[in-house]
């Protein structure tokens, strides 16, 4: 007996071939011997089966001795043994229809769990193997679970259901609601304008919710809310903003924040949270601000950085066109009685410059002694 696997909602062709390549009598019946369809002259006739309105046959193939039955919009309960009667012989085809669905909405927040449930006909013992877009493999029986969804799990999951050495493939689109980056750092010289961007790692027709940016300045003892906003159909509206700093926010997605100028007192790290309508939990993105200042005071040239920097970052003071360099894995570096010329303050990570600031040191002439 031939076994054919089908997918719920799909269309399947059950083949039945006669030895003679000509138009002949044929009938398709179910296991209860109820006629589904057949031929009467050149007319396709339908029987009293529940399947009849969804069953069809291709007249153009009858002349080739092919008397297939096509079943549209498959249901789990269509699983049965079907009998094709042609040329005084009977061909049996066992049809097994499976359905694979996500238990919840397929738009899930990062960290949430995904459960896939397999619908299968009674008496079957299928196995399921799923592969995520990122190459993660999960397998199971009637249910499959992915405990903690990650950003890279977004996309089309390919699931293979196996039964009696036959397979049928399902594709399920999963959208993991998260920002493109978990964390980002902005490096700025003192006084420069700062741009924070929070691009989502997903696209939705409608995006509605509310969000807030909390900020922990390095110099402050506690964090404070810098801005709160609403999101309605991808339109951003600010609800409340602090007076210092006076942040500006873009009206369209991706979420975009502008700090008029980078100052040492703003250096630190923030956490932007976004609560989406009809979703439990929140999207998070951490953002860091590192501010650099280079100053000359009397005989001292100083370069400082504020904000969350890694201990492996190097801070250097370097005289342009000369070999003079002072470097430290610290947040401040200085030179006493610096030579005249253009000095560069550099913050670098393994040779890659993250931030630089130039300061001109003018020659100091000794003050003439008063007679």
């Amino acid at each position: 007996k031939k076994v054919v696997l089908g997918k719920k909602g799909d269309t399947v062709e059950l083949t039945c071939n006669a030895s003679q390549k000509k138009n002949t009598q044929f009938h398709w019946k179910n296991s209860n011997q109820i006629k589904i369809l057949g031929i009467q002259g050149s007319f396709l006739t339908k029987g009293p089966s529940k399947l009849s309105d969804r069953a069809d046959s291709r007249k153009s193939l009858w002349d080739q001795g092919c008397f297939s039955m096509i079943i549209k919009n498959l249901k789990i309960e269509d699983s049965d043994t079907y009998i094709c009667e042609v040329e005084n012989k009977k061909e049996e085809v066992e049809l097994l229809v499976f359905g694979l669905t996500a238990n919840s909405d397929t738009h899930l927040l990062e960290g949430q769990s995904l459960t896939l449930t397999l619908e299968s006909p009674p008496g079957s013992s299928p196995s399921v193997k799923c592969r995520s877009p990122g190459g993660k493999n999960i397998q199971g029986g009637r249910t499959l679970s992915v405990p903690q969804l990650e950003r890279q799990d977004s996309g089309t999951w390919t699931c293979t259901v196996s039964q009696d050495q036959k397979t049928v493939e399902f594709k399920i689109d999963i959208v993991v609601l998260a920002f493109q980056k978990a964390s980002s750092t902005v490096y700025k010289k003192e006084g420069e304008q700062v741009e924070f961007s929070f691009p989502p790692a997903f696209t939705l027709e409608k995006l509605t919710g509310s969000g807030e940016l909390w900020w922990q300045a390095e110099r402050a003892s506690s964090s404070k809310s810098w801005i709160t906003f609403d999101l309605k159909n991808k339109e951003v509206s600010v609800k409340r903003v602090t007076q210092d700093p006076k942040l500006q926010m873009g009206k369209k997605l991706p979420l975009h924040l502008t700090l008029p100028q980078a100052l040492p007192q703003y250096a630190g790290s923030g956490n932007l949270t976004l609560a989406l309508e009809a979703k439990t939990g929140k999207l998070h993105q951490e953002v860091n601000l590192v501010v650099m200042r280079a100053t000359q005071f009397q005989e001292n040239l100083t370069c400082e950085v504020w904000g969350p920097t890694s201990p492996k970052l190097t801070l250097s003071l370097k005289l342009e066109n000369k070999g003079t360099t002072v470097s430290k894995q610290a947040k401040a570096v200085w030179v006493l009685n610096p030579e005249a010329g253009m000095w560069q303050c550099l913050l670098s990570d393994s040779g890659q410059v993250l931030l630089e600031s130039n300061i001109k040191v003018v020659p100091t002439w000794p003050t003439p002694v008063q007679p």
Partner: antibody, heavy 115, light 107 residues
């Protein structure tokens, strides 16, 4: 709701090979046959051929020697290749789903053969 | 090949008119016939299949009849959106063939 979206080169020189692809979205790919039909300017519709998900084909005898229809089930796509084209192959080419009747159809692609 | 012949090749009518288009097959095709509506720049649309079955979503003013070699498409009361070219198609045997079309124009 099943939708068919087609694409391919619109301008060819005589003797070149016409190549079109049709992608099936939002519906079943298996169980159906997938056809190519063309309509030369100011003329009627002409069936070119068909394929099913397992690669079984039927072609119009008038074009059989020049036609190849192939299928890529992993992408729910099927393609048409028509070799050694002449000006007589200038037409709007349509892809369509078929059991016995053509429904739905792709949006059509105008292919012009000109030297 | 089965030849499909439509008549008339064009017809002029007014909104509200009853219009009949005929299609003749060169051999018996039982009821393996479909009717399509085709508008310029659009894809053809299935109206009637199996000679007389109305495709889902098609207005009931369209009807089909016939069996064997002679078939008819009737539009009971023409609407402005019905002005188009109509084709019949046989699904009895390969190659599938279409009628040459009937252009329905506004009088």
């Amino acid at each position: 709701q099943v939708q068919l979206q087609q694409w391919g080169a619109g301008l060819l020189k005589p003797s070149e090979t016409l190549s079109l692809t049709c992608a099936v979205y939002g519906g079943s790919f298996s169980g159906y046959y997938w056809s190519w039909i063309r309509q030369p300017p100011g003329k009627g519709l002409e069936w070119i051929g068909e394929i099913n998900h397992s690669g079984s084909t039927n072609y119009n005898p008038s074009l059989k020697s020049r036609v190849t229809i192939s299928v890529d089930t992993s992408k729910n796509q099927f393609s048409l290749k028509l070799s050694s084209v002449t000006a007589a192959d200038t037409a709007v080419y349509y892809c369509a789903r078929v059991i016995n009747w053509f429904d739905p159809w792709g949006q059509g692609t105008l292919v012009t053969v000109s030297s | 090949d089965i030849q499909m012949t439509q008549s008339p090749s064009s017809v002029s009518a007014s909104v509200g008119d009853r219009v009949t288009i005929t299609c003749r097959a060169s051999q018996d095709i039982s009821s393996w016939l479909a009717w399509y509506q085709h508008k310029p720049g659009k894809a053809p649309k299935l109206l009637i299949y199996a000679a007389s079955s109305l495709q889902s979503g098609v207005p009931s003013r369209f009807s089909g009849s016939g069996s064997g070699t002679d078939f008819t498409l009737t539009i009971s009361s023409l609407q402005p959106e019905d002005f188009a070219t109509y084709y019949c198609q046989q699904a009895n045997s390969f190659p599938y063939t279409f009628g040459q079309g009937t252009k329905l124009e506004i009088k």
